[in-house]
Interface confidence: medium
């Protein structure tokens, strides 16, 4: 469909409040240093404007695209060279190239404070302008999420408020809001790590590649609907995630607001799972379905050798379409198992892919694909074992022991990644134990390496920023599916030259017995990043000396009547302790 | 019962074009994604296009990607083929089909309609 005017067709779709939260969003994902207040201003007047052109929509300017009146307004803010420095370059490029550059200076890791809840001061703030605290939500979420997906922010929104209301009445609101706020933090912070992997894939593999991923997701959730069904939603998910990466956040809302409404429309083709989120309001819809239980399998499925190795036909029927015979095959082979990680199902693929590309061209091509099934079992025992020997290690050293044996593993195989990069990624791969070990056996292959899949393409996002190893780059670029792999089958740098040691890393200060446990964790651990970096062949007997005695040293000074004192005393004896260890 | 009948075939140059239809019945036509396949003389059936029930996405076999095009209008239970640049190895009895529930094969077709490429 075509409109005059594209912001008046995308406010009457979606009304003021959605309206107005996806352009906060939209600023907020762009500019990301900008002060809440700045951005309200912006949105403010870009509000006004759309209202103008609902009005009348061939007013002045109505009928320029969304892009172009974002991109005018960002370019219009006096100070944004000198608080964004080259983003200002990007004002000098018409559009598209414009918003591409834009889309470019986004930064995944923003120097952004962490955030941190004080239930009474947020309680005064909700009940003093609901509006401002859901605003101010969105804000913070975006401003550090550049890629987060739009229209779900806005779900955790409501869901952020909801706890608010609740808790806000509460005789112990700390221990009403702080449990639930921690929990949504968690969602959040795994929501963003789905959509940046999202992005990732359509902007470094293309769209065929994110289509091949949703299309065995969505088969192994939706195991009734047929293939076209499936291919359907595919096609307009790509489309909706496609627009959202893209920074259109408008159109992927009222895109993904269709979608939703068309798969309730026809849920009978597709899921018996689906009844409870259809009767739900738009935005809990859209949730409720992309979280959709798994379809129980029809009854009656043939076994898939009758299609794809048995037939006689099978090189015909691969020959005449590609795409849409591997993409049977995909769809078939997920659909019966919904056991398996989506990046196991792609590799399986692949292979047959290859098989067929190899032995059709054969003589005789059928005896040569014979035995194309077998050719999978090495690549499901492969995840297989490995979560089997990790979560063995897990349940004997616990998180906080299993994130450091990740450390020292990681920092062995890349040294050259920068300390804070390390320690972040080590603690979420070591997070997959918590997550996926209690799982039951057949949830835990799907549940571990799509986990792991999400953590290290976090790794490939902070790498890509500032590269450092070619090993990173190569695992990182080379395959999305085999990502995984390529990390596990990393052996120790050889190659790698010992860090100086420098004593001020090994300086610690009374800071440190205030701090949370967690940030206490990862003071411990970048110290332990540090020390291999120093003495990358360090045993583990000796990383255990140290890391021990590290703890006793902290105990100690955070037990004395002077903690600074005892740091100032202690600390170079600690130092010196540490190299007499590592001699 | 289901019931497909194609029609608009015929003879046709080598360049030329045409626009096959196939008139369904007996089945809910706008729920169901159909296909159109063909057969040349002494050949085996040629899978050629699908079509979703809503109209997207479309898919194409390689050999025909670019010059066909399949297209439906569920209101009238008639699901069509225009094909452009016609060829002499298009020639074949076409018949629409009602997809199945799973594989990439079909569960009712009409009783076709040729279309001749020749000068």
């Known amino acids: 469909d075509t409109y005059k005017s594209e912001i008046a067709h995308r406010f009457k779709d979606l009304g003021e409040q959605y309206f107005k939260g996806l352009v906060l969003i939209a600023f907020s994902q762009h500019l990301q240093q900008c002060p809440y207040e700045e951005h309200v201003k912006l949105v403010r007047e870009v509000t006004e404007f759309a209202k103008t052109c609902v009005a009348d929509e061939s007013a002045e300017n109505c009928d320029k695209s969304i892009h172009t009146l974002f991109g005018d307004k960002l370019c219009a803010i006096p100070s944004l060279r000198e608080h964004y420095g080259d983003l200002a370059d990007c004002c000098e490029k018409e559009e598209p190239e414009r918003n591409e550059c834009f889309l470019q200076h986004k930064n995944d890791n923003p120097d952004i404070p962490k955030l941190k809840p004080d239930p009474v001061a947020l309680c005064a703030d909700f009940q003093e302008d609901e509006q401002k605290f859901w605003g101010k939500y969105l804000y913070e979420i975006a401003r550090r999420h550049p890629y987060f997906y739009a229209p779900e922010l806005l779900y955790y929104a409501i869901i952020y408020k909801d706890v608010f209301s609740e808790c806000c009445q509460a005789a112990d609101k700390a221990a009403c809001l702080l449990p639930k706020i921690e929990h949504l933090r968690e969602k959040v912070l795994t929501s963003a790590a789905k959509q940046r992997l999202k992005c990732a894939s359509i902007q470094k593999f293309g769209e065929r590649a994110f289509k091949a991923w949703s299309l065995a997701r969505l088969s192994q959730r939706f195991p009734k609907a047929d293939f076209t069904e499936i291919s359907k939603i595919v096609t307009d998910l790509a489309k909706v995630h496609k627009e959202c990466c893209h920074g259109d956040l408008l159109e992927c809302a009222d895109d993904r607001a269709d979608l939703a409404k068309y798969i309730c429309e026809n849920q009978d083709t597709i899921s018996t799972k689906l009844k409870e989120c259809c009767d739900k309001p738009l935005l809990e819809k859209s949730h409720c379905i992309a979280e959709a239980k798994r379809d129980e399998l029809p009854a009656d499925l043939n076994p898939l050798e009758h299609d794809f190795v048995e037939d006689k036909e099978v090189c015909k029927n691969y020959k005449e379409a590609k795409h849409v015979f591997l993409g049977t095959f995909l769809y078939e082979y997920s659909r019966r198992h919904p056991d398996y990680s989506v990046s196991l199902l792609l590799r399986i693929a692949k292979i047959y892919e290859a098989t067929l590309e190899d032995c059709c061209a054969k003589e005789d091509p059928p005896a040569c694909y014979a035995t194309v099934f077998d050719k999978f079992q090495p690549l499901v025992d492969e995840p297989k074992n490995l979560i089997k020997q990790n979560c063995e290690l897990f349940e004997k050293l616990g998180e906080y022991g299993f994130q450091n044996a990740l450390i020292v593993r990681y920092t062995k195989k890349v040294p050259q990644v920068s300390t804070p990069t390390l320690v972040e990624v080590a603690r979420k791969l070591g997070l997959v134990g918590s997550r996926c070990c209690k799982r039951p056996e057949e949830e835990r292959l799907s549940c571990a390496e799509d986990y792991l899949s999400l953590v290290l393409n976090r790794l490939c996002v902070l790498h890509e920023k500032t590269p450092v190893s070619e090993k990173v780059t190569k695992c990182c670029t080379e395959s999305l599916v085999n990502r995984r792999p390529c990390f596990s089958a990393l052996t120790p740098d050889e190659t790698y030259k010992p860090k100086e040691f420098v004593e001020g890393t090994f300086t610690f200060h009374a800071d440190l017995c205030t701090l949370p446990e967690d940030e206490k964790q990862i003071k411990k651990q970048t110290a332990l990043v540090e020390l291999l970096k120093h003495k990358p062949h360090a045993t583990e007997e000796q990383l255990r000396t140290v890391l021990g005695n590290f703890a006793a040293f902290v105990q100690k000074c955070c037990a004395a009547p002077d903690h600074e004192a005892c740091f100032a005393v202690e600390g170079p004896k600690f130092v010196i302790e540490i190299r007499g260890i590592l001699a | 019962e289901v019931q497909l009948l194609e029609s608009g075939g015929g003879l046709v140059q080598p360049g030329g074009s045409l626009r096959l239809s196939c008139a369904a019945s007996g089945f809910t036509f706008d729920t169901s994604s159909m296909l159109w396949v063909r057969q040349a003389p002494g050949k085996g059936l040629e899978w050629v296009s699908v079509?979703?029930?809503?109209?997207?996405?479309?898919y194409y076999a390689d050999s025909v990607k670019g010059r066909f095009t399949i297209s439906r209008d569920n209101s009238k239970n008639t699901l069509y083929l225009q094909m452009n640049s016609l060829r002499a190895e298009d020639t074949a009895v076409y018949y629409c089909a009602k997809f199945p529930s799973s594989r990439m094969k079909f569960d009712y077709w009409g009783q076709g309609t040729l279309v001749t490429v020749s000068s």
């Open positions: 079509i979703h029930q809503s109209g997207t996405p479309t």
